[in-house]
Interface confidence: medium
Amino acid sequence: AGGKAGKDSGKAKTKAVSRSQRAGLQFPVGRIHRHLKSRTTSHGRVGATAAVYSAAILEYLTAEVLELAGNASKDLKVKRITPRHLQLAIRGDEELDSLIKATIAGGGVIPHIHKSLIGKKGQQKTV
Amino acid sequence: PEPAKSAPAPKKGSKKAVTKAQKKDGKKRKRSRKESYSVYVYKVLKQVHPDTGISSKAMGIMNSFVNDIFERIAGEASRLAHYNKRSTITSREIQTAVRLLLPGELAKHAVSEGTKAVTKYTSSK
């Protein structure tokens, strides 16, 4: 409102494009760059491509987990992903299982009956 | 289609609101901004399963997952740069860290996604 005309007042303003948009990502490249910088040593530097690469990795892994968890929820005819679906997705995938060793709160257990406990019908042990 | 009702859609900006809580002495104190990846996780979910929602507990788990993987990659990349006497962490250090940390096919696919994003980013500069 009535401020001084700046140097570029005649030129059409170009819309700011985020680094995430430029890389075709959903995850925040700028924020990840900031976090990377805060994690390095006092005089350590972080290149721009490191943040883009990291954001892409995090987004890919997120998509992979959500893809499998969403399928688990659909198999159980539920419209919303819960910790149980995350547990089934992660533990049901060899590679994700080895990557995520943490216990998932509210994830429950993976159904498993040891072979030795599955007796033939009619051969059940009597106590 | 709408996500399930009880799955609260994350707030824009993915930060908790900076509300001012009243202190006993009458002065207002700023509540700390807590950053999370909820907004981005939600966006990705809508790409892979447009008609599926996510519970707040599951979102919390996803947020912890992203933070955990980030810490592992950043830590490994930082160590690699230090060992190789490099003052800058580049996508090369991140890629090596990913290859060291992720198992088999997961690493292969992740590396391909990372390379693709960097290529797109550098070509659009």
């Epitope: 890919y60 893809e67 590679e95 | 096919e105 696919h109």
Partner: nanobody, 123 residues
Framework: QVQLQASGGGLVQAGDSLRLSCAAA????????MGWFRQAPGKEREFVAA???????TYADSVKGRFTISKDNVKNMAYLQMNSLKPEDTGVYYC??????????????????WGQGTQVTVS
Amino acid sequence: QVQLQASGGGLVQAGDSLRLSCAAAGRSFSSYAMGWFRQAPGKEREFVAAISRSRGVTYADSVKGRFTISKDNVKNMAYLQMNSLKPEDTGVYYCAATSSGSTRQLSTGRSNYWGQGTQVTVS
């Protein structure tokens, strides 16, 4: 749950193109990751290309830049466009699907469903 039928194979010259089709019968085709594998005479079945439900495509290094995989969720079809064919592309091509929408799971051969093969011969 999903039946797959591959077609479009044939005998072509080196440098020619060919388009393979995979027709899928069954429910919720759009949620499947689809892929192509091939088996050359006397060799093991190998991964060629895959397309996920949402996250794009992945290719074997040997076909990158020459082959293109695509998917039509309306027609329940998956395609493999093969350009600049080489004699080493000869083999039986199989289409595959997995109910996990993940190309990674498909590319490791953990497919739930397989189609019968279609022969591609490059002379």
